[in-house]
């Protein structure tokens, strides 16, 4: 399965301090993106 | 089937401890990342902590409000992720749902802070 | 932190007609990739959370078309194209941008 996202990416810092965005990694650690079969609900996004 | 099923919540006094367990199946774990959500009766949820996976050293995120006196933590080798409260307050009062923020969920199990 | 307020608090729909909620943001939630991180959920009375949409428009895995998410930057509206019964319940706008997390206060569908 393709992944929908490249968790290499750091995110998108808006603000000094402020944690990596979840955007560009969670998705991929999600309960749906780790049960590989099926279908998941987040599609490729490129 | 997927399961996380929260257990620990109970009647405590302010300033006391508790420990709460989500205990997940039905998928393979070690590369999830985990949250706690708790929601106060009749109030919107309030996202309180965050644990990611080994391959992230585990790292850990906290609201501001519990920063200090809570700590999540996991156990891969029995699929569960862990809530410790320490100085409880009354407005740690609430439901806590464990959960990967998206699409799963919890039951959640109730914390209530109370002399 | 990042301030979501919904509008209206409750609205009351007739089956079969349509219902839009609204939730403005404190701050931009379009990431430099062209993602705008705003999800929406429903709470079903004595539930959790269930997922309708995320990133603003794309719906979840097994929720009907009738529900659709749309918006811009900071302003951001669900629409239920028919309303049905099992769609009682409190909705929730929520941004996973930034930490922390946050959600907005709700609003409460109930039925006429």
């Known amino acids: 399965l393709a992944d929908p996202l490249d968790h290499r990416d750091a995110g998108d810092l808006w603000f000094p301090g402020e944690s990596e965005s979840f955007e560009d990694a969670h998705v991929e650690h999600s309960i749906s993106r780790s049960l590989l079969e099926g279908e998941i609900p987040f599609p490729p996004t490129s | 089937e997927v399961q996380l099923v929260e257990t620990g919540g109970s009647l405590v006094q302010p300033g006391k401890s508790l420990r709460l367990t989500c205990a997940t199946s039905?998928?393979?774990?070690?590369?999830?990342?985990l949250h706690w959500v708790r929601q106060s009766p009749e109030k919107h949820p309030e996202w309180v902590a965050h644990?990611?996976?080994?391959?992230?050293?585990?790292?850990?995120y906290y609201a501001e409000s519990v920063k200090g006196r809570f700590t999540i933590s996991r156990d891969d080798s029995k699929s569960s992720v862990f809530l410790q409260m320490n100085s409880l307050k009354e407005e740690d009062t609430a439901i806590y749902y464990c959960?990967?923020?998206?699409?799963?969920w919890g039951q959640g199990t109730l914390v209530t802070v109370s002399s | 932190d990042v301030v979501l307020t919904q509008a209206p608090l409750s609205v009351s729909v007739t089956p079969g007609e349509s219902a839009s909620i609204s939730c403005r943001s404190s701050r931009s939630l379009l990431t430099s990739k062209g993602i705008t991180s705003l999800y929406w959920y429903l709470q079903k009375p004595g539930m959790s959370p269930h997922l309708l949409i995320y990133?603003?428009?794309n719906l979840a895995s097994g929720i009907p078309d009738r529900f659709s998410g749309s918006g811009s930057e900071t302003d951001f509206t669900l629409k239920i194209s028919e309303v049905e019964p099992e769609d009682v319940g409190v909705y929730y706008c929520?941004?996973?941008?930034?930490?922390?997390?946050?959600f907005g206060a709700g609003t409460k569908l109930e039925l006429k």
């Open positions: 039905g998928f393979p774990f070690s590369n999830v990342w």
């Open positions: 929520a941004q996973f941008l930034v930490y922390p997390y946050t």
């Open positions: 959960t990967d923020i998206l699409e799963y």
């Open positions: 644990i990611k996976a080994k391959s992230d050293n585990y790292a850990t």
């Open positions: 990133r603003m428009s």
